[in-house]
Amino acid sequence: EVEKTACPSGKKAREIDESLIFYKKWELEACVDAALLATQMDRVNAIPFTYEQLDVLKHKLDELYPQGYPESVIQHLGYLFLKMSPEDIRKWNVTSLETLKALLEVNKGHEMSPQVATLIDRFVKGRGQLDKDTLDTLTAFYPGYLCSLSPEELSSVPPSSIWAVRPQDLDTCDPRQLDVLYPKARLAFQNMNGSEYFVKIQSFLGGAPTEDLKALSQQNVSMDLATFMKLRTDAVLPLTVAEVQKLLGPHVEGLKAEERHRPVRDWILRQRQDDLDTLGLGLQGGIPNGYLVLDLSMQEALS
């Protein structure tokens, strides 16, 4: 706590300007009116205050707005935003995308901090859903943002927002997240023609079911191995050798290099060796000729 001391004669701040950087901690506390600070917050960012001085300025705003800062102040916080705790931010009601952008700009180049995560959470909850403009903004600042959301949170993303998603935005998504995003992407891109559709949907295919992969195999898409390796194992297993060959096109040769890794390894174990041999890649581990394959999962379902 800063002691309450009287402001020395002639030192009372008439405006927020660079002369204040020469004020000692107690002088700032005594000589800067909190209401003046609030109305001239836009100037603070242009003045090279020390961290100690920023602590004093924050303390003044906290006293003026114990229930949380108004958006007019929040929008101009600048570097002072880095001083806020998640608890401070939970008191805010941020509705303007411009305010969000201004604060994200301050944190640009740094990893997503707890403060930023709280700010985004408050903003998205206030809007009710993750609309396209918001998603555009967030992924521009944090390409991994989408993959930081839980499947439940992702369920509030409207299909129209999927157009804002770039392939790199999905790099760190796990299968559970892609399971939620894929149907939205399928809906968003449904009116595109074959090749264009595949280009757009490709990054989301880690959430695709078997029937969609079968359908893609009929469209000469030439899926690359990197995409194939990210597919759900349970979606790949029922595909026939012929379907995988059609799905991968010229990239089918890459299966050999990946034969020990999922989902290729598990898929090989489900195929007849005869069928695998037709690929001419030397893939081993298939079901030997003459063996009968029982689908136990089907039997369990019947019993």
Epitope: E18, I21, K24, K25, N45, A46, P48, F49, T50, Y51, E52, Q53, G78, Y79
Partner: antibody, heavy 119, light 108 residues
Amino acid sequence: SQSVEESGGRLVTPGTPLTLTCTVSGFSLSSYAMGWVRQAPGEGLEWIGTISTGGITYYASWAKGRFTISKTSTTVDLKITSPTTEDTATYFCARVGSSGYLFYFFNLWGQGTLVTVSS
Amino acid sequence: VFELTQTPSPVSAAVGGTVTIRCQASQNIKSYLAWYQQKPGQPPKLLIYEASILASGVSSRFKGSGSGTEFTLTISDLECADAATYYCQSYYAASSNAFGGGTEVVVK
């Protein structure tokens, strides 16, 4: 690429004013504050002062009156107003690590320029 | 008057070993402390800022910790190239903008 380079260091007699110049490239002095740090032979680092993007100067308490920092669009000068033998040191120019701050860490340093004060 | 005190100096350890350098501030500076490495004839090189954040391109063998008045720099898996003098610097307030006295690290 971004760089800073000091020049002007030489042998001077006590009381003869000397101005050192720091020339920057690859970034703008309107975006970053710049500081001067010195190091006497075999001794540690000593912060002298810093100049803000807006041209405001701030000095270590021991350096007030002994040094003057000023700048142009691409250079930052350090004037040693009346050198004494205690001012013999390598003088480094360094960029403050983030725009918007006057007091911060330094993330870009010059190689330094040697000033020798002797009669 | 604000002071940053570094201990010990010099400190020595064998290749592959670990050294810990301490920096003590005479006032609370929160986490606003940086660490630098300086080799003879070269300018200082930023290693760590805000007490624990590794600067770009710096090996993860360097680890900073602490807040308030007590800070440490730990160098693990020592290499010959780590032989240098290490400085801490505070930048919380105008009155506490200063460097520590330096700690020489000798690698045997």
